[in-house]
Interface confidence: medium
Amino acid sequence: EKLPKAPVITTPLETVDALVEEVATFMCAVESYPQPEISWTRNKILIKLFDTRYSIRENGQLLTILSVEDSDDGIYCCIANNGVGGAVESCGALQVKMKPKITRPPINVKIIEGLKAVLPCTTMGNPKPSVSWIKGDNALRENSRIAVLESGSLRIHNVQKEDAGQYRCVAKNSLGTAYSKLVKLEVEVFARILRAPESHNVTFGSFVTLRCTAIGIPVPTISWIENGNAVSSGSIQESVKDRVIDSRLQLFITKPGLYTCIATNKHGEKFSTAKAAATVSIAEWSKSQKDSQGYCAQYRGEVCDAVLAKDALVFFNTSYRDPEDAQELLIHTAWNELKAVSPLCRPAAEALLCNHLFQECSPGVVPTPMPICREYCLAVKELFCAKEWQAMEGKAHRGLYRSGMHLLPVPECSKLPSMHRDPTACTRLPYLDYKKENITTFPSITSSRPSADIPNLPASTSSFAVSPAYSMT
């Protein structure tokens, strides 16, 4: 009869490397008498015999993991005990090896030139995969702008047009290589004018072609503005080549004008625009630009810079010794006075005052200022600034001038031309057109003038919701 013998593990457990979804086996050979009871643990937690992920055979001496998962990584121990002497244990590690896998692949990106682009590429694998990138058919080189981050993502600072193209990321370790799908990086470029229209000094009745070339991604559209309004006459020819749009405006010249080329393209929900302007003057008129009443020129001041159209010509009244300076001082004084008025009134009053003091100008033989349309003036007076205007007129009757709008060089609305009689004879106030769409409730208005002074305009979908109604469309 055999003598009892304490268990001895004759084959200690070793580190096992296994690929995901493959079989991994630990062998724990034991010599003892009587036969031992062998149990297994993973990370010190007992593996249950009925766990279907494992197979325990050869009296418990073989542990097989039937389909290795990433989470099976850990320390596996076999413990043998037969009641003779103490239990014995041997442990070994399971290292789950994994071919590279791209868990967050890159996606198509549209980015504006000059911004930062990040193409994601998150990977899994053991050993940890190294990530590189391919652009087109070539490996992408890192430089001061282009870097592969620790996460595997590709970061491009100050994106340039030449960065556009097809990219894929490559994850590589000793077990294999994984490639992402090809993704497209599209670089959008703000509209930019390459060739501005040139100014011309021509004889009355000449034909002039103004040319404007712009570039951008997407290709911009070009529109033309004449003295602040859409071009009413002339023919436009356009051609597009290599993302460059070339627009030619042919004009028959019967009056001088300021022509602005506006290039626009769209980036998502936003638009980018670029402008360039040219003047067309009539040769004989240059001498009489500064006539006895005034002259037309660009506004060089500060106060009305944000209110007046950027390239518009405005009228300077030569009854002042230094018209530019005198009118700027007037508006500056008025501006300070407006600090006392309500937030509803102030921007409307600013638009009214700037366009009244610096009236849009047609530089004809006799430079002609274009007054504000009566309807806009009345809208400011009776709607946006109703309280302030009434207070001002009340003070005027009592001879009190203390605050608010009393110092302001305001026009007399009733003397202004109506836009309904001749829309080209007066100036609109774009601020009011915009604002009226956004105002739903208005102060109640008691007109300080007889109602006959206020034009009864036809109803319109965009009329002011106020009595009397002013139509400004």
């Epitope: 100014s199 302007a277 003047t279 003057s281 500064k290």
Partner: antibody, heavy 121, light 112 residues
Framework: EVQLLESGGGLVQPGGSLRLSCAAS????????MSWVRQAPGKGLEWVSA????????YYKESVKGRFTISRDNSKNTLYLQMNSLRAEDTAVYYC??????????????WGQGTLVTVSS | QTVVTQEPSFSVSPGGTVTLTCGLS?????????PDWYQQTPGQAPRTLIY???SRHSGVPDRFSGSILGNKAALTITGAQADDESDYYC????????????FGGGTKLTVL
Amino acid sequence: EVQLLESGGGLVQPGGSLRLSCAASGFTFSDYGMSWVRQAPGKGLEWVSAIPWSGGSTYYKESVKGRFTISRDNSKNTLYLQMNSLRAEDTAVYYCAKRSGRIAFGALDAWGQGTLVTVSS
Amino acid sequence: QTVVTQEPSFSVSPGGTVTLTCGLSSGSVTSSNYPDWYQQTPGQAPRTLIYSTDSRHSGVPDRFSGSILGNKAALTITGAQADDESDYYCGLYSYSGSKNYVFGGGTKLTVL
């Protein structure tokens, strides 16, 4: 008599900073726009920056934008030009000039004698 | 970018008349450019002669006049004198995206 006296010029290394001052007298300083104009040795005049009477806006030549700052202290009748990240091409005599009126771009009707700024390592 | 062009040099006989011009590399000079003219003698600060096309600065002799000739600004000196020998600069207000003021390269006038 209108007088404009610049100071603060000197030798500075590339990347360095200088602050120019212009003390004005003989006119109501707060009623006029002011400008800085420079002239590189043997070269022509070059407008650098402008500021209106109120100081509410500032204007710069493209090549100095973000590096130079014009300002004014109407209570001290003084115009300033803070110059940072100086480059060799900024070497010039810097003139302080008075504008003919309140606006920043009126004619330059009075000039200082200038202060020399040399940017060199 | 606005480039203002001037004749690099010009000569005139004493008592003669000379017209210096100031143009734009692209386009015409108009009164909206508010052309100004300055005179500078070597080692001196500039001096204002003409502002806003044709307005003479105080103390400037009426021998100096400004105008727009065709598509350029012009400074005309009639009855030229020896001490008119100087550099002449024109300055233009320009609005191309942002406001600025641009000087021409200057004209060296010699009175022979």
